[in-house]
Each structure stands twice: as structure tokens, then as C-alpha cells.
């Protein structure tokens, strides 16, 4: 047999035995001569070349470039390939010699009493147990233990080859501690040496680089990259790194196994790449590859090397952020820089601290934005090394969808006396201001629930055929006033008013306000009644702890069964776009009240008295009367507001003043409180008494001293008192000049 490529000028060495395979008996002599065209050498089994005592290689006597290999008394272990080759070339001729030794059919390893077989538990992998034969056509089986198991060649995946050994799928013997080959010759069993089975893993679960991404350094800094490979047990790992500047002076690689918890089904290997002082040429892709022989996994990361520390804002940094009330606002600080900057946020110059409503970090997050969040936000980036600072201003504009103030203040249902002129109002707050406020209407009887119908709070009216107020055919004559703008509670609001010339028909009116971020609406139930009439005694808003009475007067010839109710809280809130349920058609929400009935010649009067009114008494009071003939119920609603008691306060200060004799002094003392306080004046702690020169007006609010005299000089005190206490302010009046002598002297 020939090995290697034939050279143009060189023939292959020629062997004296022109066969690929030679079979000889043990104890005979093996002799092969090799002839060639230049210096030759022999290789033989086991020792392969060199100093084996029994093997003799001699120069031929009959020519140059000729060598004879002689082995006297050959044994089974001499079985193998005998190779004659030209020195320092691949050109060779090979003959495979079987030395048939029936007492030792397997070729034993020179040094070992046992061998080692490495296997992986891979279904698709086979393993070769190198029990070579000195006889080519033996019947060989493989024994594995423990437990004892025998494997016989099946002509498929299990086979024996005298030159190679026993081939078997590795998983079949992975359980075993040892294996050996066995041959049967003439009912006699012959065993190869024992092979210890060592199961080796190969699976790499993952390869992780740390830091994994966004690695930035500046020139001169140290780069440390950790590459961790997680594998199954019994795996050996080889790490290989690829990086931009391979010829690095200060590069250091350390590989080590990491300890894992006992009982862990996993092994960890770590390779650390360190570059002490990076340069710009170290910028680039760093790849770590971990190999177990059967498997390779790799991971990469990009390392950026900056010339020096720096900080700058990114091009995507916003300058204007618009949001709607209630939204979550995120303003990211977009920057370029190394190392990452310290980030500080300010609002209108005041530092922002994180709390449950706001998070001030790389991203400024306002959980639920409100109007008060409107303003200029400054973000300042500071480079931690160079201390370089960059600032940027972001304006946050918070939009408010239209909110209609009366919704929360005014009763959902009100009754209006027939024939009267009425004004309906919608006060709208919105940012930006509403671009329109439109009024609509519909007849009450078209849309009110019949008593037989079940009232659904979520949809109290079966129809919603809204008509524009310009079309008041069949309704009340209407006029919409031009929108007005008012500063209410410190907010710019738009006020739209609808004037009903004469309340003739019961209807529903709706005002709808729209701006760029939303819409708001308010539905007003305009119930016109010829029926009962409510009056409040005393005819004003009571203060808590005062008494108040509601009088319901109805024509006795038309109405009967007068009853007072209080409108209870709505079972569910009225949502935007929903309509208030007509009170008379839904008595479930009413609480019946005790009241006293009086009569005169024409009317019945039902009086409901609240002694010591409290804030809880506020609400909507309903007087219900039944038509004597039709039995139809008529309702009138009156909203009662109870004012909170407030201790007296005096607004504004009394100023000390200097006045010349004969001039006038005018001062005012404005007091507020509930109940309204009484104002009294004192001079030098004595009650000031009115006379021709001292005038008190407007409930003692204004004090005038005409033609002042020297004796008017002194400490003046204004005191405002109610049952809740007193408030006072003081001023000293200095009178200059000499007193003129009177004519009486």
C-alpha cells in the first residue's frame, strides 16, 4: 500500500512483500526489505520506531537506499502496520501484518494492564474500544460491568474491526465502570485488557460576558472582561479570545474553574481578560469562545475607548413636552458621555427629590401629571471625573380637558316656576381654553322615564335627541350670551350663559365644551312647574347652628298630599354624558322628612324646620305634591347650602397716621366671618361714642373724625366680634399743631 502523493521525481519505496496484508504464525521470523531512491526509515507497531531490542533494521548489502526489517520469533503483539518512508516526507509504503497467536488474540498495550475509554452520553456518538486483533476474522464481543452485560456485533452500529477495535454507541456503556473485549477460539475464551470507562460531558449551556454591553473606558483605564461558561458535569473547557489589538503588552489572561454548590448539575469555568491601560486601538469587538471539544459557544461585546472623559446632550433631547392631566410623563435625559454623568433635575430652579409622585433619575417620571407640574425643568449633567457640566431646559405644558365647575356645585335637578326668566350657566376651566362651548336641548317628556319603566342610573333617559339651541321650536325661547372670561379661584375660566326668556316647557339643557385634549359636558334638568313653591326662612343661606325652615306652599284646590323629601346621595355618580334622573320618577333616592302642615283659605303650607343646621343638612330638598284630579306628582327641588362657622378676621391693617388739627381722618375696618361679626371702635381702650365730630357708618366699618382736635390723639382699636370670638387691629393717631382758641373765651 502507498501513502502520500507520488512526487514527480520520486517513486514510492518498494517493499519485498507486495501485499497490503500479511498473515504469519507466531514464533516465525518476519523479514521485509524496502528499496527507494533516497534515505529510508521504518516504523512498526507499539514502539513505532527506535530502540525496540527485538526489531532489527539493517542496510542491504546489494544497494544504496535499501533497508531490511527483521523480527525473529514474532508474537501476537507484533501485529500492526509496518511503514517504510522517505525521511522528512509523507511518501511511504505500508503493509499490515497479522501475527496469528491463538493464545493471545488481542494485541496488548505495551505498558498498561488496563486502558481508559472516554465517552460522551450522546445518543448519536459511538466509541471505539481499541482491542485490536492479531487475527483478522475473530468472533469478538464486548463485556461491560457492572452489572454484567455482553454486546455482540449487529452488522449495524455495533462492530469489531481487527485494525481498529470494538465500535459501539457510547450511551450503551455509559453506565459501566469497565469494559473488555472477548474472543472465542475453539471453545476457549480470550480477553483483552480492561478498559476503564470515563464519561466526559461536552454540553456548554451558555457563555456570558461581564460586563455584557455598553463597556466604555477612557484611554489609560483598565479593562477587565470576565467570560463565564456554564457546562454539564465532566467537561473540560478551552477558552479562546479574539480582540482588536492582539499584540498587547499589558494583556493578561487567567482561566480557572469556579466552585459550584454540591449536588449541582452544572460546572462553571471563568476566563478573565485584563488590559491594564487601554489605548484607542483597543476599541472594538471582544469575543470569548469556550470549547469542550464537541461543542463551541461564543459571546461578544463591544468596547468603546474614549480619548478623555466627556459629557453632552444627545440629539433626541426634548425641549417641549406636552401632556394631559392624569397621564404619566416620562422625560428621559438623553446624553452621550463617559463615564455616565450624575443627573440632577430642577423645577423652576428648585432641586427635585424623588417621592411617590415623581421619580427624578435618568428619566424624570411624573406618575400622574397635574396642572401644578407645568413649568420649566432643567436637567444638569455632571461628568464625575472632569466635573464638566451641561444643562438643558425642558418646558412641560400640562393640558386640562374641559371641566365644568357647576357640575359639582349645583343640584342635578332644579325646578323653575312657570313664566319666569332663568339663566343657566356653565363655567369651564380648560387648558388650552375651550375652542367652543355649545348648548343643546331636548324636551323632558320625550326623554324622561315613565314611572312604569325601570330607572337605570347609568342611562336614566331613554333618548338623547339633542337639538341645537338655535332651533328652539316647541321649547323655551333662548338666547346664548357671548362667552365671558373670569378669574375664579385664581384660574382663568370661560363662562357661558344661556338665558331662557320664559320658562314655559320642561326641558333638558346641555352645555358641551371642547378643547384640543378633550371634552366636558353638563346636563341641566330644567323642570318647569306651575305647582308648589318653595321658600326658605330666613331668606338666605344659614350658618351652621342657626335654624332654617323650608316652606312648601301649594294651591289646596289643585294639590294634595304635600310631602318633604331630601334627595339622598346618588346610588352611583353621574358620569360625563349621563343625565340626572327626574326626581319625581325615582322616589328611591329620596328620604322622607318630618314636617308640619298649615293651611290658610287657599293654600296648604308644609314647613320643614332644621334647628341647629349642620353641614350634613346641606343638599337638595324636594317638595312633592299630587294633582287632585290627575294624581300626577309634581316636584320642586331647592338646594340648601349651610355656611360653615368662621371666626372673625379683619382684612387689611389700620395704619398709624399723623394729622394736623382741623383736618379729617377717615379709616375703614373690613371684617369677615360667619356669623357676620359686630364691629366696635375703641379709643385708648374705651368705647368710642359717636358725636358731631365722630361718625360711624356701614355697620361701624367706616370711622370718620371731622375737624380733629388735640384730644382726638390716641390709640384707636377696631374690634370685630361674634359668638366665635373677636379680632382686633390697632393704630395710633398723632395730631399735630396748636389748638386754636375758640370765640367763647
Amino acid at each position: 500500500a502507498s501513502v502520500g502523493l507520488p512526487s514527480v521525481s520520486l517513486d514510492l519505496p518498494r517493499l519485498s512483500i507486495q501485499k497490503d496484508i500479511l498473515t504469519i504464525k507466531a514464533n516465525t521470523t518476519l523479514q521485509i526489505t524496502c528499496r527507494g531512491q533516497r534515505d529510508l526509515d521504518w516504523l512498526w507497531p507499539n514502539n513505532q520506531s527506535g530502540s525496540e531490542q527485538r526489531v532489527e533494521v539493517t542496510e542491504c548489502s546489494d544497494g544504496l537506499f535499501c533497508k531490511t526489517l527483521t523480527i525473529p520469533k514474532v508474537i501476537g503483539n507484533d501485529t500492526g502496520a509496518y511503514k517504510c518512508f522517505y525521511r522528512e516526507t509523507d511518501l511511504a509504503s505500508v503493509i499490515y501484518v497479522y501475527v496469528q497467536d491463538y493464545r493471545s488474540p488481542f494485541i496488548a498495550s505495551v505498558s498498561d494492564q488496563h486502558g481508559v475509554v472516554y465517552i460522551t452520553e450522546n445518543k448519536n456518538k459511538t466509541v471505539v474500544i481499541p482491542c485490536l486483533g492479531s487475527i483478522s476474522n475473530l468472533n469478538v464481543s464486548l463485556c461491560a460491568r457492572y452489572p454484567e452485560k455482553r454486546f455482540v456485533p449487529d452488522g449495524n452500529r455495533i462492530s469489531w474491526d481487527s485494525k481498529k477495535g470494538f465500535t459501539i454507541p457510547s450511551y450503551m456503556i455509559s453506565y459501566a465502570g469497565m469494559v473488555f473485549c472477548e474472543a472465542k477460539i475453539n471453545d476457549e475464551s480470550y480477553q483483552s485488557i480492561m478498559y476503564i470507562v470515563v464519561v466526559v460531558g461536552y454540553r456548554i449551556y451558555d457563555v456570558v460576558l461581564s460586563p455584557s454591553h455598553g463597556i466604555e473606558l477612557s484611554v489609560g483605564e483598565k479593562l477587565v472582561l470576565n467570560c463565564t461558561a456554564r457546562t454539564e458535569l465532566n467537561v473540560g473547557i478551552d477558552f479562546n479570545w479574539e480582540y482588536p489589538s492582539s499584540k498587547h503588552q499589558h494583556k493578561k489572561l487567567v482561566n480557572r474553574d469556579l466552585k459550584t454548590q454540591s449536588g449541582s448539575e452544572m460546572k462553571k469555568f471563568l476566563s478573565t481578560l485584563t488590559i491594564d491601560g487601554v489605548t484607542r486601538s483597543d476599541q472594538g469587538l471582544y469575543t470569548c469562545a469556550a470549547s469542550s471539544g464537541l461543542m463551541t459557544k461564543k459571546n461578544s461585546t463591544f468596547v468603546r475607548v474614549h480619548e478623555k472623559p466627556f459629557v453632552a446632550f444627545g440629539s433626541g433631547m426634548e425641549s417641549l413636552v406636552e401632556a394631559t392631566v392624569g397621564e404619566r410623563v416620562r422625560i428621559p435625559a438623553k446624553y452621550l458621555g463617559y463615564p455616565p454623568p450624575e443627573i440632577k433635575w430642577y423645577k423652576n430652579g428648585i432641586p427635585l427629590e424623588s417621592n411617590h409622585t415623581i421619580k427624578a433619575g435618568h428619566v424624570l417620571t411624573i406618575m400622574e401629571v397635574s396642572e401644578r407640574d407645568t413649568g420649566n425643568y432643567t436637567v444638569i449633567l455632571t461628568n464625575p471625573i472632569s466635573k464638566e457640566k451641561q444643562s438643558h431646559v425642558v418646558s412641560l405644558v400640562v393640558y386640562v380637558p374641559p371641566q365644568i365647575g357647576e357640575k359639582s356645585l349645583i343640584s342635578p335637578v332644579d325646578s323653575y316656576q312657570y313664566g319666569t326668566t332663568q339663566t343657566l350657566t356653565c363655567t369651564v376651566y380648560a387648558i388650552p381654553p375651550p375652542h367652543h362651548i355649545h348648548w343643546y336641548w331636548q324636551l323632558e317628556e320625550e326623554c324622561a322615564n315613565e314611572p312604569s319603566q325601570a330607572v337605570s342610573v347609568t342611562n336614566p333617559y331613554p333618548c338623547e335627541e339633542w337639538r341645537s339651541v338655535e332651533d328652539f321650536q316647541g321649547g323655551n325661547k333662548i338666547e346664548v350670551n357671548k362667552n365671558q372670561f373670569a378669574l375664579i379661584e385664581g384660574k382663568n375660566k370661560t363662562v357661558s350663559t344661556l338665558v331662557i326668556q320664559a320658562a314655559n316647557v320642561s326641558a333638558l339643557y346641555k352645555c358641551e365644551a371642547v378643547n384640543k385634549v378633550g371634552r366636558g359636558e353638563r346636563v341641566i334638568s330644567f323642570h318647569v312647574t306651575r305647582g308648589p313653591e318653595i321658600t326658605l326662612q330666613p331668606d338666605m343661606q344659614p350658618t351652621e347652628q342657626e335654624s332654617v325652615s323650608l316652606w312648601c306652599t301649594a294651591d289646596r284646590s289643585t294639590f294634595e298630599n304635600l310631602t318633604w323629601y331630601k334627595l339622598g346621595p346618588q346610588p352611583l355618580p353621574i358620569h360625563v354624558g349621563e343625565l340626572p334622573t327626574p326626581v319625581c320618577k325615582n322616589l328611591d333616592t329620596l328620604w322622607k322628612l318630618n314636617a308640619t302642615m298649615f293651611s290658610n283659605s287657599t293654600n296648604d303650607i308644609l314647613i320643614m324646620e332644621l334647628k341647629n343646621a349642620s353641614l350634613q343638612d346641606q343638599g337638595d330638598y324636594v317638595c312633592l305634591a299630587q294633582d287632585r284630579k290627575t294624581k300626577k306628582r309634581h316636584c320642586v327641588v331647592r338646594q340648601l347650602t349651610v355656611l360653615e362657622r368662621v371666626a372673625p378676621t379683619i382684612t387689611g391693617n389700620l395704619e398709624n397716621q399723623t394729622t394736623s388739627i382741623g383736618e379729617s381722618i377717615e379709616v375703614s375696618c373690613t371684617a369677615s366671618g360667619n356669623p357676620p361679626p359686630q364691629i366696635m371702635w375703641f379709643k385708648d381702650n374705651e368705647t368710642l361714642v359717636e358725636d358731631s365730630g365722630i361718625v360711624l357708618k356701614d355697620g361701624n366699618r367706616n370711622l370718620t373724625i371731622r375737624r380733629v382736635r388735640k384730644e382726638d390723639e390716641g390709640l384707636y382699636t377696631c374690634q370685630a366680634c361674634s359668638v366665635l370670638g373677636c379680632a382686633k387691629v390697632e393704630a395710633f393717631f398723632i395730631i399735630e399743631g396748636a389748638q386754636e382758641k375758640t370765640n367763647l373765651e
Epitope: 335654624s547 332654617v548 290658610n600 314647613i607 334647628k611
Partner: nanobody
């Protein structure tokens, strides 16, 4: 100083009559509304009858309607309560009350001035 002085109370058999008078001093009966209240033992004071300024309209509680009549004599600055067909449940102290011109003093919260009261006892 406003003073209201009641008289005419006393004891009477059920079905009998009594006439209560209330003389006002320091207060014009014709320019203000007037009324009568009563308080039975263990009960709250309640409005019985009222008359508006000028005497053009009179008001009665349901319990006395048709039996009691309120009137006034502007010249004497006096208000009267004529009580007919008296019942044992009419037993009470009767008070004269003066209010503003409007509304008539049918409930306590609109009363400005009170009389001392006169006892009426009706036995069955």
C-alpha cells in the same frame, strides 16, 4: 322694649270654648305677623295658628283647622285665639308669638318675640 302678655287661659270641659288674648306693647300688630304656639307636657312647642301683617291671611295647623280662629284688633294692638270644641289633647301652655312682616310665625325659627304663656286645661 317689646312685651307680649297672654290672658284668657283656664280650665274647661271637653267640647267647651275659650278665647285667648295677647296684648303687644312696643310692637305693632298690624305691621307684623303674629301667631299662637302651644306646648303640651312632655312634648315640643308647636305652631297652632298664624296671621300675616295686615290680617289678610290666616294659617292653621291641621290638628285645629275648623275649630280655632285667629284674629287681630289693630286699634287695641291685640291678637286673639278663639278656641271652640276643645278636646283633652288641646291641654297645653299657649304662647303668643311675634314675627317679621313675613312669613307668619308658625314655627319657632321665625319667632322674634315670645309671651310668657297661659295654661289651658281641657278635661273629659
Amino acid at each position: 322694649q317689646v312685651q307680649l302678655q297672654e290672658s284668657g287661659g283656664g280650665s274647661v270641659q271637653a267640647g267647651g270654648s275659650l278665647r285667648l288674648s295677647c296684648v303687644a306693647s312696643g310692637y305693632s300688630v298690624s305691621k307684623n305677623s303674629m301667631g299662637w304656639f302651644r306646648q303640651a307636657p312632655g312634648k315640643e312647642r308647636e305652631g297652632v295658628a298664624g296671621i300675616n301683617e295686615g290680617g289678610t291671611a290666616t294659617y292653621y295647623a291641621n290638628s285645629v283647622k275648623g275649630r280655632f280662629t285667629i284674629s287681630q284688633d289693630n286699634a287695641k294692638n291685640t291678637v286673639y285665639l278663639q278656641m271652640n270644641t276643645l278636646k283633652p289633647e288641646d291641654t297645653a301652655i299657649y304662647y303668643c308669638a311675634a314675627g317679621s312682616p313675613d312669613p307668619p310665625p308658625l314655627i319657632e325659627s321665625v319667632v322674634k318675640y315670645w309671651g310668657q304663656g297661659t295654661q289651658v286645661t281641657v278635661s273629659s
